[in-house]
Interface confidence: medium
């Protein structure tokens, strides 16, 4: 029969062969034969595979650092990673709570929607059209841009989300 | 590298006022939002006040507005907070804080005791 050129769902090809991949929570020890099963093995301790993979080495859970203010809210498995948490008060920077923060700040382009209290964190709105912030703050909200109109000057540059318009004198020419 | 070095604090009575300063180093101080946070004793973090990069937008927790007062001398890389009609639950090290990452770019505070 000819070698197959694809193989089924949860199984990978090798040697133009087709070998069953290892479960969630095993990692691969050797590829099948065509006399033997592929052989996969349980991770350690502290390791985890979350797919169904041929990978040969688990990979670490997260470790939460209790110096970064993290502390773990799910414990890992052999098939699910570490789930970090921040101390209460805290707000993680990130889906990933890599780190804390008392308060997030909204990045240039956003402004704060609702300042943070006690229970919640900072909630950052994009600043529309007409409007900019151009810091990264956890008070500030968008600024309206500059009237030039009002000051009897023209835009010479145009505002964006992350800075204000230029305002230029008109020109006096007239034809 | 960042530094932050905070003085001022000290024992003061009920109703008493001080002012706590906070030297800044190592950085561009005039970009930067400052804040004050407070640690009172057996308890959290509390944000207390913050103040934008130029010094001219201020903000306050409750339990501190009318009676501490944010100021910044960009020219001396300064952070002030004027604190007022102290009361005892304002018993706690204060802090001087560039960014609000967990003890990240942190002076090692200042004592505030408020007793009779």
């Known amino acids: 029969p000819e070698p197959p050129t694809a193989c089924r769902e949860k199984q990978y090809l090798i040697n133009s062969q087709c070998c069953s991949l290892c479960q969630p929570g095993q990692k691969l020890v050797s590829d099948c034969t065509e006399f033997t099963e592929t052989e996969c093995l349980p991770c350690g301790e502290s390791e985890f595979l979350d797919t169904w993979n041929r990978e040969t080495h688990c990979h670490q859970h997260k470790y939460c650092d209790p110096n970064l203010g993290l502390r773990v809210q799910q414990k890992g498995t052999s098939e699910t990673d570490t789930i970090c948490t921040c101390e209460e008060g805290w707000h993680c920077t990130s889906e990933a709570c890599e780190s804390c923060v008392l308060h997030r700040s909204c990045s240039p382009g956003f402004g704060v929607k609702q300042i943070a209290t006690g229970v919640s964190d900072t909630i950052c709105e994009p600043c529309p059209v007409g409007f900019f912030s151009n810091v990264s703050s956890a008070f500030e909200k968008c600024h309206p841009w500059t009237s030039c109109e009002t000051k009897d000057l023209v835009v010479q540059q145009a505002g964006t989300n992350k800075t204000d318009v230029v305002c230029g004198p008109q020109d006096r020419l007239r034809a | 590298e960042v530094q932050l070095l905070e003085s001022g604090g000290g024992l003061v009575q009920p109703g008493g006022s001080l002012r706590l300063s906070c030297a800044a180093s190592?950085?561009?101080?005039?970009?930067?939002?400052m804040q004050w946070v407070r640690r009172a004793p057996g308890k959290g973090l509390e944000w207390v006040s913050a103040?934008?990069?130029?010094?001219?937008?201020?903000y306050y927790a409750d339990s501190v507005k009318g009676r501490f007062t944010i100021s910044r001398d960009n020219s001396k890389n300064t952070l002030y907070l004027q604190m007022n009609s102290l009361r005892a639950e304002d018993t706690a090290v204060y802090y001087c804080?560039?960014?609000?990452?967990?003890?990240?770019?942190w002076g090692r505070g200042t004592l505030v005791t408020v007793s009779s």
């Open positions: 804080a560039k960014e609000l990452l967990y003890f990240d770019y």
């Open positions: 103040i934008s990069g130029d010094g001219y937008r201020t």
């Open positions: 190592g950085f561009t101080f005039g970009w930067y939002e």
